[in-house]
Interface confidence: low
């Protein structure tokens, strides 16, 4: 997170830290006691699928305070439409091997109903993004969980206000832009997969997933997030289906 | 809200209760009627919570101890009669007034629903947690807010 602040301990209780072979991989969002939402691109280069760990209740990576809960990732489900190395359909659903225990420091973020997300949450201007990613483009990652308030843009406005870059990916209907184009604040590498959380009348909802951008906090560019509302039915159907064998599963979308 | 009290016994009311503090018994002497005394006393001792005219859209206000109740006209609902029940009450307009989820219905008014782990309150729009750790709430902030002293 570039230009953010420390999320006070316990105030981002749905934030997930994903580790592979003990090393920081990505962020994620707890949506109930056994399921985590993250970004598909986080898993492009994974070879040791059995060494994936999700940590809940984490705050400061340099110390263990007893509120952390670690769970093996039993399954990673990615939409069949996602192509590794690209940006569209950048979403993954992770099934934990065992449920986490909900505590003051471990709470799920609400996965909203699609219509509510599209016609109400999408028009809430500011939302929070969080993670332990880089504090500057090409800089060091954070030890404490960072958080940033970002404004959402309509895709048309995002395209009009962004500098044209020759090989820049399209902003599709499965994405949205949020943040600042003045180079001051953005999510960054290492925050990928983490939550874009929107507050409405006293409750927080998952509206986006940290996905991609032209560098981090680059002048003339916004951060791009996976538009979660497009995947609500896909996620719910998967969460209700019986577990399948194998760690990586490509599930048909839509 | 309590204009009728003024015409009851203006002289003694001014003398006993407005120029100086009066007790419930003294007020009872003035009004000679338990119900009217009670109505006067709620407003007199506690301040009239209806004084700020909180009930909107033609709703009438009844003062209570440290609170008030709005009686809404048929086309309105909500604590302050602020929500329209009529054709404007559809989900695309301010989420239909619902705290969480809203469903439109042909021929009848919209209905509000809540996420799992919450249930709908009697006002038909608000949601209350039914589990210890409902999604989307931050326990340490909820507890902090709950322990803050309330303004009078």
């Amino acid at each position: 997170i570039v230009g953010g602040k420390v999320c006070p301990k316990g105030e981002c209780p749905w934030q997930v830290l994903l580790l592979v072979n003990g090393a920081q991989l990505c962020g994620g969002t707890l949506i109930n006691t056994i399921w985590v939402v993250s970004a598909a691109h986080c898993f492009d280069k994974i070879k040791n699928w059995r060494n994936l760990i999700a940590v809940l209740g984490e705050h400061d990576l340099s110390e263990h305070d007893g509120d952390e809960q670690s769970r093996r990732v039993a399954q990673v489900i990615i939409p069949s439409t996602y192509v590794p190395g690209t940006t569209n359909h950048d979403i993954a659903l992770l099934r934990l091997h065992q449920p986490v225990v909900l505590t003051d420091h471990v709470v799920p973020l609400c996965l909203p109903e699609r219509t509510f997300s599209e016609r109400t949450l999408a028009f809430v201007r500011f939302s929070l993004v969080s993670g332990w990613g880089q504090l500057l483009d090409r800089g060091a990652t954070a030890l404490e969980l960072m958080v940033l308030n970002v404004p959402r843009l309509m895709t048309q406005d995002c395209l009009q206000q962004s500098r044209k870059v020759g090989d820049s990916p399209n902003i599709t209907e499965y994405m949205f832009c949020a943040g600042y184009s003045d180079g001051s604040k953005d999510s960054c590498k290492g925050d990928s997969g983490g939550p874009h959380a929107t507050h409405y009348r006293g409750t927080w909802y998952l509206t986006g997933i940290v996905s991609w951008g032209q560098g981090c906090a680059t002048v003339g560019h916004f951060g791009v997030y996976t538009r979660v509302s497009q995947y609500i039915e896909w996620l719910q159907k998967l969460m209700r289906s019986e577990p399948r064998p194998g760690v990586l599963l490509r599930a048909p979308f839509p | 809200a309590n204009a009728f009290l003024e015409e009851l016994r203006p002289g003694s009311l001014e003398r006993e209760c407005k120029e100086e503090q009066c007790s419930f018994e003294e007020a009872r002497e003035i009004f000679k009627d338990a119900e009217r005394t009670k109505l006067f006393w709620i407003s007199y001792s506690d301040g009239d919570q209806c004084a700020s005219s909180p009930c909107q859209n033609g709703g009438s206000c009844k003062d209570q101890l440290q609170s008030y109740i709005c009686f809404c006209l048929p086309a309105f609902e909500g604590r302050n009669c602020e929500t329209h029940k009529d054709d404007q009450l559809i989900c695309v307009n301010e989420n239909g007034g619902c705290e969480q989820y809203c469903s439109d219905h042909t021929g009848t008014k919209r209905s509000c629903r809540c996420h799992e782990g919450y249930s709908l309150l009697a006002d038909g729009v608000s949601c209350t947690p039914t589990v210890e750790y409902p999604c989307g709430k931050i326990p340490i902030l909820e507890k902090r807010n709950a322990s803050k002293p309330q303004g009078r």
């Epitope: 949506i31 109930n32 056994i34 099934r95 934990l96 065992q98 | 469903s103 799992e116 039914t130």
Partner: antibody
Framework: QVQLQESGPGLVKPSQTLSLTCTVS?????????WSWIRQPPGKGLEWIGY???????NYNPSLKSRVTISVDTSKNQFSLKLSSVTAADTAVYYC???????????????WGQGTSVTVSS | EIVLTQSPATLSLSPGERATLSCRAS??????LHWYQQKPGQAPRLLIK???QPATGIPARFSGSGSGTDFTLTISSLEPEDFAVYYC?????????FGAGTKLELK
């Protein structure tokens, strides 16, 4: 094939504690399921008592919460129910059960024990 | 808590006929409703989960529909083994609650 088997005394005296055990076979109790107790008084409907995860987290019916304890013994692949201060109103068939899948708070009970009848009487 | 009201309490039909059982929730529960069948002396058996998804091994004559507060279990053509008590269950909010049941009896 998942199988659940309830065991415990069929007769309990009023004011005593009812204790039942559910032995699970064909499935590791330390997996991701929720393990429930549900009861059915004679000739009446079903009442959910509560459940436990391997992780140890529990959720009880508020109407029984003050009297109920559900615990798990992973080494024996068993989970147990204790219901204190019983009265004749606690006379019922007690079922142990496993949820088919788990999604937030919403799960359907796909596997049931055959039930054990408990009578509360002096 | 969410109260589920099942109707009718008793339904008398003959084999081959169509059975329609109703379950009404005291407040909206989206599609978090499950149906069970129970025969005398047996444990309940899951028929339908999440309003309309048949559980493993359930015959195609059983189907479920509805959303919000009104739900229906339909048995398209009754077989002799279908005569039993049917319960609906709320899976939306704790405590998990069951309806009082509908007894489907032979006419």
């Amino acid at each position: 094939q998942v199988q659940l088997q309830e065991s415990g005394p069929g007769l309990v005296k009023p004011s005593q504690t009812l204790s039942l055990t559910c032995t699970v076979s064909g499935y590791s109790i330390s997996s991701d399921s929720a393990w429930s107790w549900i009861r059915q008084p004679p000739g009446k409907g079903l009442e959910w008592i509560g459940y436990i995860y391997y992780s140890g987290s529990t959720n009880y019916n508020p109407s029984l919460k003050s009297r109920v304890t559900i615990s798990v013994d992973t080494s024996k692949n068993q989970f147990s129910l204790k219901l204190s201060s019983v009265t004749a109103a606690d006379t019922a068939v007690y079922y142990c059960a496993r949820s088919v899948n788990y999604y937030g708070n919403s799960f359907a009970v796909g596997y049931w024990g055959q039930g054990t009848s408990v009578t509360v009487s002096s | 808590e969410i109260v589920l009201t099942q109707s009718p309490a008793t339904l008398s039909l003959s084999p081959g006929e169509r059975a329609t059982l109703s379950c009404r929730a005291s407040q909206g529960i989206s599609d978090y409703l499950h149906w069970y069948q129970q025969k005398p002396g047996q444990a309940p058996r899951l028929l339908i989960k999440y309003t309309s998804q048949p559980a493993t091994g359930i015959p195609a004559r059983f189907s479920g529909s509805g959303s919000g507060t009104d739900f229906t279990l339909t048995i398209s053509s009754l077989e002799p083994e279908d005569f039993a008590v049917y319960y609906c269950q709320n899976g939306h909010s704790f405590p998990l609650t069951f309806g009082a049941g509908t007894k489907l009896e032979l006419k």
